[in-house]
């Protein structure tokens, strides 16, 4: 059977957590990705983000997660309205933020 | 030192409102990561939960009992208050308040407790 | 709302058996499970949280176990201290419930 909303959203959370606890070398060799608007539309749009980044097996799991919550295919290169324009921060600090907002979603019981 | 003490009427009559105050000792709830839970102990039985709050303010009820609880807090007074309006005997208990931490994975384990403050609803 | 069920309801050991109380959770709740030590007349304290990790100053004896819906508290070599009566709590989802608690005596 499909996994509550919630439990997927807890799992998500979980995986942001064990990335930013284990961190030893830059993550992601310090690639850069767009900054996005949290307010709206998030799941998507940290995906349309983190896509861009290859190659990099500590995110790969956060990609699959990220997917299984954006209703539409998304593939690189591909920018929604919800970036913010020409902000570029750290796969680390992008996760850090995303973390922060999604524990508030979590906590506020909105996982859909 | 980590503490929490609810304060509370003792006695209150059925259809009134009843207010409960916890204060904080040895930690803020301005703190991120921090937040408090109410629960509560009829004479005999077991622990049911009610009411909890965040440090961002983000509150969360029992659905049994949220018409009729307010769960809130005055950082400055280090203070979170519950209100329980149409009190019944049934809400005869000890009410305690405990403290949650979150830190990396939403735990919801209540760490540190209150002593427990006797509320007795009857005419 | 996610149902604990508690066993034994209460139980009676002599000081240095091995007592291990069960819980059951109505739907998997992902280790999220915390154990509560409450003495006569005393609030209740945190003895073990996600399934079986400690807070500092909890004894070695208190261990927890288990996974999905099932969960076990075990005290390896019962005290007289340890008189009490013993809560679990799911912290997956709210809202926050509490088994129905095994009150352990001395024989």
């Known amino acids: 059977s499909p996994v509550p909303r919630s439990t997927a959203l807890k799992e998500l959370i979980e995986e942001l957590v064990n990335i930013t606890q284990n961190q030893k070398a830059p993550l992601c060799n310090g690639s850069m990705v767009w900054s996005i608007n949290l307010t709206a539309g998030v799941y998507c749009a940290a995906l349309e983000s983190l896509i861009n980044v290859s190659g990099c097996s500590a995110i790969e799991k956060t990609q699959r997660m990220l997917n299984g919550f954006c209703p539409h295919k998304v593939s690189a290169g591909q920018f929604s309205s919800l970036r913010v324009r020409d902000t570029k921060i750290e796969v680390a600090q992008f996760v850090k933020d995303l973390l922060v907002h999604l524990k508030k979603l979590f906590r506020e019981g909105r996982f859909n | 030192e980590v503490t929490l003490r609810e304060s509370g009427p003792g006695l209150v009559k059925p259809t009134q409102t009843l207010t409960l105050t916890c204060t904080l000792y040895?930690?803020?709830?301005?703190?991120?990561?921090?937040?408090v839970d109410w629960i509560r102990q009829p004479p005999g039985k077991g622990l049911e939960w009610l009411a909890h709050i965040w440090w961002d303010d983000v509150k969360r009820y029992n659905p049994a009992l949220k018409s009729r609880l307010t769960i809130s807090k005055d950082t400055s007074k280090n203070q979170v208050v519950l209100k329980l309006t149409s009190v019944d005997p049934v809400d005869t208990a000890t009410y305690y308040c405990?403290?949650?931490?979150?830190?990396?994975?939403?735990?919801?384990?209540?760490?540190?407790w209150g002593q427990g403050t006797l509320v007795t609803v009857s005419s | 709302d996610i149902q604990m069920t508690q066993s034994p309801s209460s139980l009676s050991a002599s000081v240095g058996d091995r007592v291990t109380i069960s819980c059951r959770a109505s739907q998997d709740i992902r280790n999220y499970l915390n154990w509560y030590q409450q003495k006569p007349g005393k609030a209740p304290k945190l003895l073990i949280f996600?399934?079986?990790m400690k807070p500092r100053g909890v004894p070695s004896r208190f261990s927890g176990s288990g996974s999905g819906t099932d969960y076990t508290l075990t005290i390896s070599s019962l005290q007289p201290e340890d008189i009490a009566t013993y809560y679990c709590q799911q912290g997956n989802t709210l809202p926050l419930t509490f088994g129905g608690g095994t009150k352990v005596e001395i024989k």
């Open positions: 040895g930690f803020s709830l301005s703190t991120s990561d921090m937040g």
């Open positions: 996600y399934t079986s």
């Open positions: 405990a403290r949650t931490v979150s830190s990396g994975y939403i735990y919801y384990a209540m760490d540190y």
